[in-house]
C-alpha cells in the first residue's frame, strides 16, 4: 500500500479513491461505482448509443472515442462555424453542401447535377441513362436493342449518341408523304426492275426481290463460265449448243455431218427462232437415225456411247430452246417416226398428259418448274424409235431385288441373254433439270410389239455412265403391268425410257390371277 493512502492496483482508465478503492475515469464505467478489487475493469461508455443523453442535432453524426465522443457533420454537410467537431446540439452549425456548385463536372457528360440534402443526383439528358455500375455516369440508351422497337418493320433502327433514327432499308424508299429518319418513317420496297434503277446486263432479266433485285439469264441463255446466275453482276451468253459436240474417240462421217448441222443452227440461233430451231434439230436427228450410215459399222459399245451422247444432248438443248416458246401445246412428227410433244405454260396446278403415237406421259405440273424460276414451265416428250438401232444389245443392270425376282419367277436367261427392246425409246424432260427425285411420280404408257407369251417385260431408263456411255437400268422405275401390246411404267425420276422384254422363261404362273375366259 501507498504511504499516502492510495491503492496501487487500480485497473486501467481508473483513479484511486483511497488505499482500498478506485473509481473509473470520466467516460468509463464499471460494474459498481467504487472498485474494490483489482479484478474489475473500466469500460468505455458509448455516448453515441441510442439511449444516451448526448444529442448532436440534425445533419450530424455522433462518433464515439475512448473515454469521450465527438459530433461531426454528416457527409454532404459542413459546419458554418468551421469547427470540425462539437459536443452537443447547441454547438451544431451543420448545413448542406451544394456539391453541384463546388464541382460542375460531377455528372460528367450527358448529365445534369441536381443538389439534394446531403448529396446530389445526376439527371441524364433524353436518350441517356445512368450506368448501373457507376450511378454518376450517364451512358447512351441504345433504343434499337432495348426491346422498345421504336421503328416500323419496313425500316432499320440506327442508334445515335442520345437518339436514334429509323432509316429505310437498302433497296427501300419512304412511302409517299413519309419522312426518312424520324420514328414515324414508313418505307416500301423499291422495284429496281420497273424503276430502271437496276444494273442488270442486257443478257439477263431483272427480277425484283424484297429490298433488292437479281439478274437472271434470259430463257435459253446460260451464265458465262465461272459467273453464277441470279446475281447483280450475272452476265449470260446465248446457249449456242456449244456442249453438244461429237463424243470423243468416235469416228463417223454421218455423226460429224449431224453435229455440223447442230453447230450451224447454234450460230444462227436467236430466241425468236426457238420453234424453227427445235424442228430443224429433230429433223436432222430423224434423218441421222433413219440412215445411220457408218454409225452401224461401229463396235456395239461405241454405238451405245453415241446413243447416250445423243439422248443427253438432245434433252439439254430441247430444255433450253423450249423456254423461249410461247404458251401452248406443240406436236411435231417426222418421217422416220421421231415425235415431239411439248407443253409450255405459266405454272398451273394440275396434271399434264402428253400423248403420242406410241407413248403417253402423265405427271404433275408442279414438277416442271424450279421454285423461283421466272420462266415458263415446260414438259416435253420425245419418241425416238430410230435410237433402237444404236441401242441394240445394250446391257441391262438390274437392282439386286429385281434380279432375285426374275430368277425366282423364271427358269433363267435363255439364248444370248440380251433383253429385247419392245418399245420406242422416249426421252422426257422438264424446264426444271433437277429431275432425279420427283416428289410425285411420272407414269408412262407404252404401246409396243406383242410380248412373247410367258416372257416378262421391264420398264427401264437409260443410265448415262461416267465413261460417257451407259446401260439400261430399273432403279426408281416400277412396271405397273403389261397386257399384250401395252405396258405402264411408274418412275420417280426423268431420263430416257423404254420397255424391254427379258429373255427369261417363266417358271410358274400365279394360279390366283389366271384368267377365266
Amino acid at each position: 500500500q501507498d504511504s499516502r493512502g492510495c491503492a496501487r492496483w487500480c485497473p486501467q482508465d481508473s483513479s484511486c479513491v483511497n488505499a482500498t478503492a478506485c473509481r473509473c475515469n470520466p467516460g468509463f464505467s464499471s460494474f459498481s461505482e467504487i472498485i474494490t478489487t483489482p479484478m474489475e475493469t473500466c469500460d468505455d461508455i458509448n455516448e453515441c448509443a441510442t439511449l444516451s443523453k448526448v444529442s448532436c442535432g440534425k445533419f450530424s453524426d455522433c462518433w464515439n472515442t475512448e473515454g469521450s465522443y465527438d459530433c461531426v457533420c454528416s457527409p454532404g454537410y459542413e459546419p458554418v462555424s468551421g469547427a470540425k467537431t462539437f459536443k452537443n446540439e447547441s454547438e451544431n452549425t451543420c448545413q448542406d453542401v451544394d456539391e453541384c456548385q463546388q464541382n460542375p463536372r460531377l455528372c460528367k457528360s450527358y448529365g445534369t447535377c441536381v443538389n439534394t440534402l446531403g448529396s446530389y443526383t445526376c439527371q441524364c439528358l433524353p436518350g441517356f441513362k445512368l450506368k448501373p455500375e457507376d450511378p454518376k455516369l450517364c451512358t447512351d440508351v441504345n433504343e434499337c436493342t432495348s426491346g422498345q422497337n421504336p421503328c416500323h418493320s419496313s425500316t432499320h433502327c440506327l442508334n445515335n449518341v442520345g437518339s436514334y433514327q429509323c432509316r429505310c432499308r437498302p433497296g427501300w424508299q419512304p412511302i409517299p408523304g413519309s419522312p426518312n429518319g424520324p420514328n414515324n418513317t414508313v418505307c416500301e420496297d423499291v422495284d429496281e426492275c420497273s424503276s430502271g434503277q437496276h444494273q442488270c446486263d442486257s443478257s439477263t432479266v431483272c427480277f425484283n426481290t424484297v429490298g433488292s433485285y437479281s439478274c437472271r439469264c434470259r430463257p435459253g441463255w446460260k451464265p458465262r463460265h465461272g459467273i453464277p446466275n441470279n446475281q447483280k453482276d450475272t452476265v449470260c451468253e446465248d446457249m449456242t449448243f456449244s456442249t453438244w459436240t461429237p463424243p470423243p474417240g468416235v469416228h463417223s462421217q454421218t455423226l460429224s455431218r449431224f453435229f455440223d448441222k447442230v453447230q450451224d443452227l447454234g450460230r444462227d440461233y436467236k430466241p425468236g427462232l426457238a420453234n424453227n430451231t427445235i424442228q430443224s434439230i429433230l429433223q436432222a436427228l430423224d434423218e441421222l437415225l433413219e440412215a445411220p450410215g457408218d454409225l452401224e459399222t461401229l463396235p456395239r459399245l461405241q454405238q451405245h456411247c453415241v446413243a447416250s451422247h445423243l439422248l443427253d444432248g438432245l434433252e439439254d438443248v430441247l430444255r433450253g430452246l423450249s423456254k423461249n416458246l410461247s404458251n401452248g401445246l406443240l406436236n411435231f412428227s417426222y418421217p422416220a417416226g421421231t415425235e415431239l410433244s411439248l407443253e409450255v405454260q405459266k405454272q398451273v396446278d394440275r396434271s399434264v398428259t402428253l400423248r403420242q403415237n406410241q407413248a403417253v406421259m402423265q405427271l404433275d405440273w408442279n414438277q416442271a418448274q424450279k421454285s423461283g424460276d421466272p420462266g415458263p414451265s415446260v414438259v416435253g416428250l420425245v419418241s425416238i424409235p430410230g435410237m433402237g438401232k444404236l441401242l441394240a444389245e445394250a446391257p441391262l443392270v438390274l437392282e439386286p431385288e429385281k434380279q432375285m425376282l426374275l430368277h425366282e419367277t423364271h427358269q433363267g436367261l435363255l439364248q444370248d441373254g440380251s433383253p429385247i427392246l419392245l418399245s420406242d425409246v422416249i426421252s422426257a424432260f422438264l424446264s426444271n433439270n433437277d429431275t432425279q427425285n420427283l416428289s410425285s411420280p411420272v407414269t408412262f404408257t407404252f404401246s409396243h410389239r406383242s410380248v412373247i407369251p410367258r416372257q416378262k417385260v421391264l420398264c427401264v431408263f437409260w443410265e448415262h455412265g461416267q465413261n460417257g456411255c451407259g446401260h439400261w437400268a430399273t432403279t426408281g422405275c416400277s412396271t405397273i403391268g403389261t397386257r399384250d401390246t401395252s405396258t405402264i411404267c411408274r418412275c420417280t425420276h426423268l431420263s430416257s425410257f423404254a420397255v424391254l422384254m427379258a429373255h427369261y422363261d417363266v417358271q410358274e404362273e400365279d394360279p390366283v390371277l389366271t384368267v377365266i375366259t
Epitope: S351, T353, V360, Q362, L363, D364, E399, P400, E401, K402, M404, L405, E408, T409, S439, S440, P441, V442, T443, T445, K456, S478, T479, I480, G481, T482, R483, S486, I488, R490, D510, V512, L513
Partner: antibody
C-alpha cells in the same frame, strides 16, 4: 393356302405410336409386293402404303406420309407398319394385302382379316 | 370424299342383273386399264372379283363381269343370288402420288 394375319392393333392416345405386323404364309413372301389398306368404321377402303418384294421401294398415301413407315422382314415372312404421331382420323381397321409377284400392279388378290386401331384420348 | 364415285346403294331381285358404276378422271379410270372390283361382306376382308377392268381371278363366278367406257368403269352381276348381297368397291391405278384410289363403296341389296 395363302394366309395373312395382322396383329398389333389397339387403343392409343393421339400423338402415340403403334407397330402393326402381318404374318404371311402359304406363298413365297419375298417375291411379292405387299400393301396396307385401311377402312374407318362404316366407311370405304383407303390405300395406305406399299413396299416392293425386296423392300427397296416404298410409297405412302399423302395423309400418312412422314408419320407411317412400311417395312418387311423376308426372313420372318412378316410385313410391318410403324405408325407414329397418330391422329383420331387414323382410327380404322388396317388390312394387310398381297400385290403382284412381279409387276407393281394396283390390285390385291389376298387380304388379311384386319386389325383395329383406335386413336382416342 | 372418295376419289372415285360410286352409287351408295343398288338393289335387285334374285335372278336379275344389276350394274354398279365407278366414275373417275383421265388420271385414273380413264387413263389406265387398271380398274379392280372388290366384294366385302359385313365383318369380313375384301375379296378381289375383277382386275384390269374385265379379268376374273380363278374361283370367281362368271356371273361377275367388268367393263370400261371413258372415265367410267362398270361391274355387272347377272343372275343375282342372295350371297351376292355385300358392299362392292372399285379401285383404279392413278398417276398421282397416291398410286391407287378406291370408290366410296356401293351396298348391294338382294330383295
Amino acid at each position: 393356302e395363302v394366309q395373312l394375319v395382322e396383329s398389333g392393333g389397339g387403343l392409343v392416345q393421339p400423338g402415340g405410336s403403334l407397330r402393326l405386323s402381318c404374318a404371311a404364309s402359304g406363298f413365297t413372301f419375298r417375291s411379292y409386293w405387299m400393301h396396307w389398306v385401311r377402312q374407318a368404321p362404316g366407311k370405304g377402303l383407303v390405300w395406305v402404303s406399299r413396299i416392293s418384294s425386296g423392300g427397296s421401294t416404298t410409297n405412302y398415301a399423302d395423309s400418312v406420309k412422314g408419320r407411317f413407315t412400311i417395312s418387311r422382314d423376308n426372313a420372318k415372312n412378316t410385313l410391318y407398319l410403324q405408325m407414329n404421331s397418330l391422329r383420331a382420323e387414323d382410327t380404322a381397321i388396317y388390312y394387310c394385302a398381297r400385290g403382284d409377284n412381279y409387276y407393281d400392279s394396283p390390285y390385291f388378290d389376298y387380304w388379311g382379316c384386319g386389325t383395329l386401331v383406335t386413336v382416342s384420348s | 370424299q372418295s376419289a372415285l364415285t360410286q352409287p351408295a346403294s343398288v338393289s335387285g331381285s334374285p335372278g336379275q342383273s344389276i350394274t354398279i358404276s365407278c366414275t373417275g378422271t383421265s388420271s385414273d379410270v380413264g387413263g389406265y386399264n387398271y380398274v379392280s372390283w372388290y366384294q366385302q361382306h359385313p365383318g369380313c376382308a375384301p375379296k378381289l372379283m375383277i382386275y384390269e377392268v374385265s379379268y376374273r381371278p380363278s374361283g370367281v363366278s362368271n356371273r361377275f363381269s367388268g367393263s370400261k367406257s371413258g372415265n367410267t368403269a362398270s361391274l355387272t352381276i347377272s343372275g343375282l343370288q342372295a350371297e351376292d348381297e355385300a358392299d362392292y368397291y372399285c379401285s383404279s391405278y392413278t398417276s398421282s402420288s397416291t398410286y391407287v384410289v378406291f370408290g366410296g363403296g356401293t351396298k348391294l341389296t338382294v330383295l
